[in-house]
Every structure is written in structure tokens, then in C-alpha cells.
Interface confidence: low
């Protein structure tokens, strides 16, 4: 059967805590098993004896999003006698070839999903913009938490806006999901939002939302 090839290009793909570990190559005559260190630093087998080159580890990493998880991908010959005892995988008394993934700290490393502008509320010359607080896959007491519930005041939004007829843009940062500006009556304003995590040194910002203009909003509402 030959010696199994070690996995390479181990990459974490994670958005709003939905987290998948991907790697290469496609296996031939062997399978992969992923191990992840849990909150107690035990190795736990996931995606046991799979021929896939990805493994969904969301259920593990959402248990504590402030923990730095370690993971490894083991290459296991198909025809060997294998036994897994929960935290170890042994082939004829030897650990199979494996490759370590980079450490993954969900709070720091998960990408922020594209935010959605939920609504505009106008009160005279004040325009209030509300950004939808999207759900994550992090649970507490059986309920999925929102981004705001997970990140608290560490979550902010960069709101870029312009008058509909203007090319000049203004940018503001808020640490809530709402933002107010003074507007001129009868003028359309267009908004673009990015989520950000203040404490991060890299991977700080989300992709931008779709640009939404107040005139479009009125037509959405049938006004």
C-alpha cells in the first residue's frame, strides 16, 4: 500500500465561527483522521478515516472561542489495523504520519461575515442606520449567540456614506449596531458597512456590505 502521504497546505476556513479545516492532497489507498486539542488539551478524533480533504470542526471550536486550538491531520493506511482510543490513534503501535495545523484562536481568527444594513429610520433631519446583528454558531444555554453577544464592545462597524449625488465620502466608526447622521431633507444617502474587531492585529475587518441608498430603501418599503 506504500507509505501514506503527509497532508499539506493545512488551512482554517472560518466565518462567524463556522470553521472548517482544509488540506491537500486527495488520498490514495489511505484515509485521514483529524485530531483537535479540546479545552482540556486532550486530543479528540474528528472526521475519522475520511477520504475528504476537509473537516468541519465548528462543534469543537465554539465550546470556547477564546481558546487557542491545535489540530493535526493524520494519514492512515487503509489496510492497516487501526484503533482509536479517544485521544490517540495507533497503527501497529506507531502513530501515523501527521501534519500540524497552525494554531486557531476563534475569537482572533474567524473571519467576519458580510454585514447587512437592516433598516433606516428617519426622524426629521436625523437618519438612523441599523446593521443586522447576525447569528453565529456559538451557543449558550442552547441558544445561538449573535456577533454582538460574542464580541461585545470589541465589535465595531465602519460606516462609509455619501450623498447620492456626491463622490465625496465620509467614514465613521461605531461600537454599536446603530449609527445616526444629520441629513438634508429630500436628499438620498448611500451607505456601505464593514464590521471590525477592535482588538485584532490582523484579519480585523469583514468584507463590505452591499451599498444601500435611502431612495432604494423607500422603494423597498413601497413608499
Amino acid at each position: 500500500a506504500g507509505i501514506p502521504e503527509k497532508a499539506f497546505n493545512l488551512t482554517w476556513i472560518s466565518t462567524d465561527f463556522k470553521t472548517i479545516l482544509e488540506w491537500q492532497p486527495k488520498p490514495t489507498n489511505y484515509t485521514y483522521t483529524v485530531q483537535i486539542s479540546d479545552r482540556s488539551r486532550n486530543w479528540k478524533n474528528k472526521c475519522f478515516s475520511t477520504t475528504d480533504t476537509e473537516c468541519d470542526l465548528t462543534d469543537e471550536i465554539v465550546k470556547d472561542v477564546t481558546w487557542a486550538y491545535e489540530a493535526k491531520v493524520l494519514s492512515v493506511p487503509r489496510r492497516n489495523s487501526v484503533h482509536g482510543d479517544g485521544d490517540q490513534l495507533v497503527i501497529h503501535g506507531e502513530e501515523p504520519p501527521f501534519t500540524n495545523a497552525p494554531k486557531f484562536l476563534p475569537y482572533r481568527d474567524t473571519n467576519l461575515g458580510q454585514p447587512v444594513i437592516q433598516q433606516f429610520e428617519q426622524d426629521g433631519r436625523k437618519l438612523n442606520v441599523v446593521v443586522k446583528d447576525s447569528l453565529t454558531l456559538v451557543r449558550k444555554n442552547g441558544t445561538f449567540l449573535t456577533l454582538r453577544q460574542v464580541f461585545g464592545k470589541d465589535l465595531g462597524y465602519i460606516i462609509t456614506y455619501r450623498k447620492g449625488s456626491s463622490t465625496g465620502k465620509k467614514t465613521n466608526i461605531t461600537n454599536t449596531n446603530e449609527f445616526s447622521i444629520d441629513v438634508e431633507e429630500g436628499v438620498s444617502y448611500c451607505f456601505f458597512v464593514q464590521a471590525m474587531i477592535f482588538s485584532r492585529k490582523t484579519n480585523q475587518n469583514s468584507p463590505g456590505s452591499s451599498t444601500v441608498c435611502t431612495e432604494q430603501w423607500k422603494s423597498f418599503l413601497g413608499e
Epitope: R39, R41, N42, W67, A68, E70, N100, P102, K103
Partner: antibody, heavy 118, light 104 residues
Framework: QVQLKESGPALVKPTQTLTLTCTFS??????????VGWIRQPPGKALEWLAL???????RYSTSLKTRLTISKDTSKNQVVLTMTNMDPVDTATYYC??????????WGQGTLVTVSS | DIELTQPPSVSVAPGQTARISCSGD??????AYWYQQKPGQAPVLVIY?????GIPERFSGSNSGNTATLTISGTQAEDEADYYC?????????FGGGTKLTVL
């Protein structure tokens, strides 16, 4: 108040086995993510990491010294023990035990000087 | 295993800013920690998780690319000490070789 104190022989002979004990208070080795590690420092030289044991008995060792090191814990006595076999004069150093919180070494013992000489 | 490289010595005049570097492959992808050690004493944590302070405000840290940097603003005579950076690789802890900070 977290406190750690190292104890063991001040002098060992070459080829002998060194046994060091770290006795700690103010920390629980049954808390997830907490560990106790050993670091040494030869006179006038840099810090060198040796070994680490976490609350769940997960053990980690220096790549270059792992064949000579054994770390264990006795939670009931609030102690962590390090043994190092086949001691050599180059192992003369101050040996520190320290408290880990994930990767952060936030509390250190005062250190104990071990001299290896015949 | 990752290797961390520090300059053996750095000198600074009192009141000036001292910067001590620590380099290692892709160090910015990991967290860096800094310890201060005075003669005859155990090390003391000064910076953890790149830029969180363990002791006085004049100490700060940064970490990106291949280099972590400890910055001491308004250096005082009492800051004269050896400084060690630390990071980790899979399942191991790694220290730099240490930098002796001399306050002139």
C-alpha cells in the same frame, strides 16, 4: 497569591539523575488550561525551556532534551516533579518552575541552583 | 522548531525610548511574550499576547511579520535588566537569547 518554590539537591554528580520538586500554592492544577513548567538558566546565559505539564496531565518536553526528562504532578500535594537523567556539568544552572496560563508564563518561582560536579 | 533571535545588547539614555527586537519565522502569526530579569532574580512577565502589559505603562509591545518588538518609553535606570522574548511552536515553548538593556 500564587507562589511556587523549587526544591532539590544543590549538587549532583555527573551521570546521576536530578529530581526537582515544585511546590505551589494559590493555584489549582485542576483548572483547565493551567499548567506548571520548568525553565533553566546556566550562569550568565539565556533561559531554556525544559518541560510542561497541564491540568489534564498533558505533558510537553523540550525537543532536544525529551529523552532525559520526565515531568509528573501530584495534585493532592500541590507538587510537580521534574527528573532529568544522565546529568552533565553543562546542566549546571538555576532551575525555575513557573505557572502557565495557556502559553503565558505569569508566575515564576525564585529558582534553585543545581551544580553538576564530581 | 521556531528559533527566536534577539540582539545581545541595547543601550539607551535615560528618558529616551528603547526598542528590543525579537525575530522568528512568521512570528506575527503567533503571540509573543516578554520577560524582564534583573540580576539574581527570577524573570517577571512584562508583555503578554503581543501587547498586553504585565507591568508599568511605559512598556508596550507589537508583533507582525517576522518581528516582535518591546518598546520602553521614557526609559528609567530601574529598567536596566535582561529582556527575553518567548513564543511557542506546536507543543513547545521557545525563548529568545535575551537582550541586555543598558541605561547610560
Amino acid at each position: 497569591q500564587v507562589q511556587l518554590k523549587e526544591s532539590g539537591p544543590a549538587l549532583v554528580k555527573p551521570t546521576q539523575t536530578l529530581t526537582l520538586t515544585c511546590t505551589f500554592s494559590g493555584l489549582s492544577l485542576s483548572t483547565s488550561g493551567v499548567g506548571v513548567g520548568w525553565i533553566r538558566q546556566p550562569p550568565g546565559k539565556a533561559l531554556e525551556w525544559l518541560a510542561l505539564i497541564y491540568s489534564n496531565d498533558d505533558k510537553r518536553y523540550s525537543t532536544s532534551l525529551k529523552t532525559r526528562l520526565t515531568i509528573s504532578k501530584d495534585t493532592s500535594k500541590n507538587q510537580v516533579v521534574l527528573t532529568m537523567t544522565n546529568m552533565d556539568p553543562v546542566d549546571t544552572a538555576t532551575y525555575y518552575c513557573a505557572r502557565y496560563k495557556q502559553e503565558t508564563i505569569d508566575y515564576w518561582g525564585q529558582g534553585t541552583l543545581v551544580t553538576v560536579s564530581s | 522548531d521556531i528559533e527566536l533571535t534577539q540582539p545581545p545588547s541595547v543601550s539607551v539614555a535615560p528618558g529616551q525610548t528603547a526598542r528590543i527586537s525579537c525575530s522568528g519565522d512568521n512570528l506575527g502569526e503567533k503571540y509573543a511574550y516578554w520577560y524582564q530579569q534583573k540580576p539574581g532574580q527570577a524573570p517577571v512577565l512584562v508583555i503578554y499576547d503581543d501587547n498586553n502589559r504585565g507591568i508599568p505603562e511605559r512598556f508596550s509591545g507589537s508583533n507582525s511579520g517576522n518581528t516582535a518588538t518591546l518598546t520602553i518609553s521614557g526609559t528609567q535606570a530601574e529598567d536596566e535588566a535582561d529582556y527575553y522574548c518567548q513564543s511557542y511552536d506546536i507543543e513547545i515553548t521557545v525563548f529568545g537569547g535575551g537582550t541586555k538593556l543598558t541605561v547610560l
